[in-house]
Amino acid sequence: KWETKNCSVSSTNANDITQSLTGKGNDSEEEMRFQEVFMEHMSNMEKRIQHILDMEANLMDTEHFQNFSMTTDQRFNDILLQLSTLFSSVQGHGNAIDEISKSLISLNTTLLDLQLNIENLNGKIQENTFKQQEEISKLEERVYNVSAEIMAMKEEQVHLEQEIKGEVKVLNNITNDLRLKDWEHSQTLRNITLIQGPPGPPGEKGDRGPTGESGPRGFPGPIGPPGLKGDRGAIGFPGSRGLPGYAGRPGNSGPKGQKGEKGSGNTLTPFTKVRLVGGSGPHEGRVEILHSGQWGTICDDRWEVRVGQVVCRSLGYPGVQAVHKAAHFGQGTGPIWLNEVFCFGRESSIEECKIRQWGTRACSHSEDAGVTCTL
């Protein structure tokens, strides 16, 4: 029932505007005049609705219907005109509030003294507001009763309805603006400082970038003391035995060197960055890889025979007998290093395969991958 809705919205807005304008203790004559004008408009509206009720009996007489409809149209136009006046008045007061907000800064110290008076005034205003709300509720009831009779006239009044809705929408926007001003003023009064929150959690680690170009070979440095034992390289054939070096005192661990070229022998040495855990023998188990100094597992997404083949061959086995999913050899405890690994099957180690991302949060240890290598 559009009439009820429009009147109730207007009533609520009127209440909000009154609160917004009086709730700050700016009891200037201008504001009091605005209240009076507003209440007068509301009173006029009430009288006009009462007039519609009085004319209700005349509706039965079809002879007077058309004349009545035209009169009603005229009355709604009057209401629309009054709403426009009200809108202009509210706009004027919006400008006044802008100026008031500017002067509030300089009045800040004075307002602190007035705070007690404001609280008393607020109490009175709340009483007045409560009374106004009761009156508006009664008015809403009356309007609801009237709206039942007016429903028959809805077709002729569609155009008018749209216009009034538009005006109410504008009024809503103004009210919201006033509410916002009210909030800004209260924030100024409370002197609240907003503190920036802590930074968010770090994003996921980016994909590994492509290998950079090799730089030119540098001049050989002096023979340094031996570093800590590095990771074992990929399967290579042993070269000829070198001459024994001078014994040196142990030094700091040096950076990992580049992978050497294959020698000419035929002995397979396993790639120590991969191990099999939890199987019946060394040829099978949950696949664990050493990365960043920590052993971790591989998620079984896209875990297929070609990947298992690479793992087994890198460990010195001739091939893969089976690949296992869903933590077949038990769940690991370390990080889940890899989610999706893609191999064609002939790569010398799993690191040579296409790895989308190191360190994944998309899997759980219930999806740890395993292999059984052929003996």
């Epitope: 492509p210 290998t211 064609f344």
Partner: antibody, heavy 121, light 108 residues
Framework: QVQLVQSGAEVKKPGASVKVSCKVS????????IHWVRQVPGKGLEWMGG????????IFAQEFRDRVTLTEDTSPDTAYMELSSLKSEDAAVYYC??????????????WGQGTLVTVSS | DIQMTQSPSSLSASVGDRVTITCRAS??????LNWYQQKPGKAPKLLIY???SLQSGVPSRFSGSGSGTDFTLTISSLQTEDFATYYC??????????FGQGTRLEIK
């Protein structure tokens, strides 16, 4: 050490089909992937299709999508490439090759000896 | 699809010469470029992968460089067995794999 041995030369009529085989040794067929590349005499190399581990399926170059069929027989570890509706432009040497990832990129380090297919009416 | 263009299409040189072949991609392919050598009646042979990594067993006189769209294959001192056709191949887009049209290296 992987080895790829292809079937012998073929002479076909336009509209017919040709089936080239590629026998794998050193690995089983399930342990690696086979791709096919052709070379028209006096021209460059043209990739036809093969298994993509990222997609988990065999994919083809647009030009061959409707005419080429790639199959595998695991008991003799042999891969097959069948090209249908032959045209004179299909006369070429057909190679099977096995890829691997080289620093995340795809490279072909083992090739079959090639099979010459002649299309003549 | 990514187009690969090699230049020159043919080249004459003498034993001992330093030879450079270039390959240009139609869009940036990072360093995902390989070089192959092919001799008449034979299958291609991988020389260099990912722009500059020398394949095992390939003589050190072969070297590769470049990144993005422009790449070069250099033979520092040409030997008799190096006279062949050379192809570049990109694998940036995974599939379709595309090759250059080839550069034929002949004896002067």
């Amino acid at each position: 050490q992987v080895q790829l041995v292809q079937s012998g030369a073929e002479v076909k009529k336009p509209g017919a089909s040709v089936k080239v085989s590629c026998k794998v040794s050193g690995y089983t067929l399930t342990e690696l992937s086979i791709h096919w590349v052709r070379q028209v005499p006096g021209k460059g190399l043209e990739w036809m299709g093969g298994f993509d581990p990222e997609e988990g399926e065999t994919i083809f170059a647009q030009e061959f999508r409707d005419r080429v069929t790639l199959t595998e027989d695991t008991s003799p570890d042999t891969a097959y490439m069948e090209l249908s509706s032959l045209k004179s432009e299909d006369a070429a040497v057909y190679y099977c090759t096995t890829p691997r990832y080289c620093n995340n990129g795809i490279c072909y380090d083992y090739w079959g000896q090639g099979t010459l297919v002649t299309v003549s009416s | 699809d990514i187009q690969m263009t090699q230049s020159p299409s043919s080249l004459s040189a003498s034993v001992g010469d330093r030879v450079t072949i270039t390959c240009r991609a139609s869009q940036s392919i990072s360093n995902y470029l390989n070089w192959y050598q092919q001799k008449p009646g034979k299958a291609p042979k991988l020389l260099i992968y990912t722009a500059s990594s020398l394949q095992s067993g390939v003589p050190s006189r072969f070297s590769g460089s470049g990144s993005g769209t422009d790449f070069t294959l250099t033979i520092s001192s040409l030997q008799t067995e190096d006279f062949a056709t050379y192809y570049c191949q990109q694998s940036y887009s995974n599939f379709p794999i595309t090759f250059g049209q080839g550069t034929r290296l002949e004896i002067k």
